[in-house]
């Protein structure tokens, strides 16, 4: 079962509709004035505690507050990805959870947050100034990322307070492109609600041919527009250490970044309500430099602790290169 | 086509060392996951250790910890397990998998029989 | 990790039966669990994962259901060559786990 979000979408004007125009002018406003109320900067948090029974055993929480959803989580240690920091576990919403030594236990705590665990024995252990950054990947609004370490002075059983984006990136191709279309529309909104103050509304005359058309309609998007305008889904760019870094480009990497997305995923109710469902296929995989992978394929989606996927229109094995860091 | 093919297992002394391969064709070796699984005398599976694609990641089961260490040369497309401090209940079959990305093992080693015995 | 439990150890049955394994995980899994064969002296195949999706190949008498923690095995009428050990696997978080395997035997 496909759940997808109905995000209100323009249906151009039927032929031969009277006072189409109209009714579209009232319509743009309010789609546009839903996207610049809901258009907030994201931000990642991340709390890290010393647990008291075990002076080396850490638990670092993070969490994404955005409208987005999000579709990859990578949680890393010994600086944020793209200066030294190693992967310590990948979180895909739909996917799964992999995580390397010397995590313990990483888990979806709500659909926008994760709780990792690391041991506290062994050559890998943390100390306790070690810097652990956590990076979201989310839809529409790029990569973000952030990082925190215990205070110098903590007691063992005391946390950090959660610490917001002290290294917020984000990716350009993500944010710039939403926040511009958004400030675009902004503008256009403050322009046509002027216009609006200084002429009378048109008289809208029913239509011949649909009653309800033209209206903010739902996308449920079709193969064909799928096909048309395929975008992967997670966006992480930036990488582990040099001298470690899981990569891989399958079929000549990742030639994606431009592409515009054309699903809205749902978000998922909570870890109570996240519905278990077929997974797809496997096949038709983006390469992503840290060597994590996103998967699509035929089958229908899985919504674990829940996203919705998009499917290569390609099917299985269209762009199959594996998993990097699983 | 993949294969995978396991080598290196035999009959060892408790405390003992013992080093295994897997040499993989059929795909570009670095870049996927590999992973070695052991299935006991017992029929119980194991999942042993896994290695990232580059080598950078590593996972070993606790019962493994710090006496086998896995890794790979994707220059030879191969895959190893280096296992030392053998005990009995390391007796087993190894065998090299792959998983697919996100999902389980499709490909599987034919299996190489380590027995652990004085 | 998460543990994986297969109730039945064995199962004795006749050609043509329909045959119902059941796997069940410790905690949710989102239907991320796999099933195997295993004939004696060949590694295992991968016959099912995400629950409900065959691999390619597989016979459609074999099928998949579940969710959350419960998970089904279901092979509609048994034939000779299904005689072997079947075993659940969860790929939902690392490291994976094995559930102790189901044998089949003709009767």
């Known amino acids: 079962m496909r759940t997808e979000a109905q995000v209100p979408a323009l249906q151009p004007p039927e032929p031969g509709l009277e006072g189409a125009m109209g009714h579209r002018t009232l319509v743009l406003p309010w789609v546009l004035l839903t996207l610049c109320v809901t258009a907030g900067t994201p931000e990642v948090w991340v709390q890290v505690r010393m647990e008291a029974t075990e002076l080396s055993s850490f638990t670092i929480r993070c969490g994404f507050l955005g409208s987005g959803s999000i579709s990859l989580v990578t949680v890393s240690w010994g600086g944020p990805n793209g200066a030294g920091g190693t992967t310590l576990a990948v979180l895909h919403p739909e996917r799964g959870i992999r995580q390397w030594a010397p995590a313990r236990q990483a888990r979806w705590e709500t659909q926008s947050s994760i709780s990792l665990i690391l041991e506290g024995s062994g050559a890998s252990s943390p100390c306790a100034n070690t810097t652990f950054c956590c990076k979201f990947a989310s839809f529409p609004e790029g990569s973000w990322e952030a990082c925190g370490s215990l205070p110098p002075s903590s007691d063992p059983g005391l946390s950090a307070p959660p610490t917001p984006a002290p290294i917020l990136r984000a990716d350009l191709a993500g944010i710039l492109g939403v926040s511009g279309v958004l400030l675009f529309g902004c503008v256009y909104l403050l322009h046509l609600l002027r216009r609006h103050k200084h002429r009378p509304a048109p008289r809208l005359q029913p239509s011949r041919t649909s009653p309800q058309a033209p209206r903010a309609r739902a996308w449920a998007p079709s193969q064909a527009s799928q096909a048309a305008l395929h975008v992967p889904y997670a966006t992480i760019n930036t990488s582990c250490r040099p001298a470690t870094l899981d990569t891989a480009h399958p079929h000549g990497g990742p030639s994606w970044w431009a592409s515009l997305p054309t699903h809205a995923a749902h978000r998922p109710q909570g870890p109570a309500a996240w519905a278990s469902t077929p997974i797809p296929a496997r096949g038709s995989f983006v390469s992503v430099e840290n060597g994590l992978y996103a998967q699509a394929g035929e089958r229908p989606p899985h919504t674990g602790p829940g996203l919705t996927l998009f499917p290569d229109p390609r099917g299985p094995r269209a762009m199959e290169g594996p998993l990097g860091v699983r | 086509e993949v294969k995978l093919v396991e080598s290196g297992g035999g009959l060892v002394q408790p405390g003992g060392s013992l080093k295994l391969s897997c040499v993989a064709s059929?795909?570009?070796?670095?870049?996927?996951?590999m992973s070695w699984v052991r299935q006991t005398p017992e029929k119980r599976l194991e999942l042993v250790a896994d290695i990232s694609n580059s080598g950078g990641n590593t996972y070993y089961s606790d019962t493994v910890k710090g006496r086998f260490t896995i890794s790979r040369d994707n220059a030879k497309n191969t895959l190893y397990l280096q296992m030392s401090s053998l005990k009995s209940e390391d007796t087993a079959m190894y065998y090299c998998?792959?998983?697919?990305?996100?999902?389980?093992?499709?490909?599987w080693g034919q299996g190489t029989l380590v027995t652990v015995s004085a | 990790d998460i543990q994986m439990t297969q109730s039945s150890s064995s199962f004795s049955v006749s050609l043509g039966d329909r045959v119902t394994i059941t796997c069940k995980a410790s905690e949710d899994i989102y239907a991320r669990l796999a099933w195997y064969q295993q004939k004696p002296g060949n590694a295992p195949r991968l016959l099912i994962s995400?629950?409900?999706s065959l691999e390619t190949g597989v016979p459609s008498r074999f099928s998949g259901s579940g969710s959350g923690k419960n998970y089904t095995l279901s092979i509609t009428s048994l034939q000779t060559e299904d005689v072997g050990t079947y075993y659940c696997?969860?790929?939902?978080?690392?490291?994976?786990?094995f559930g102790g395997g189901t044998n089949l035997e003709i009767k």
């Open positions: 059929g795909f570009t070796f670095n870049t996927y996951i």
């Open positions: 998998a792959r998983p697919d990305n996100w999902d389980p093992f499709v490909y």
């Open positions: 696997q969860q790929h939902w978080s690392t490291p994976w786990t």
């Open positions: 995400g629950a409900t």
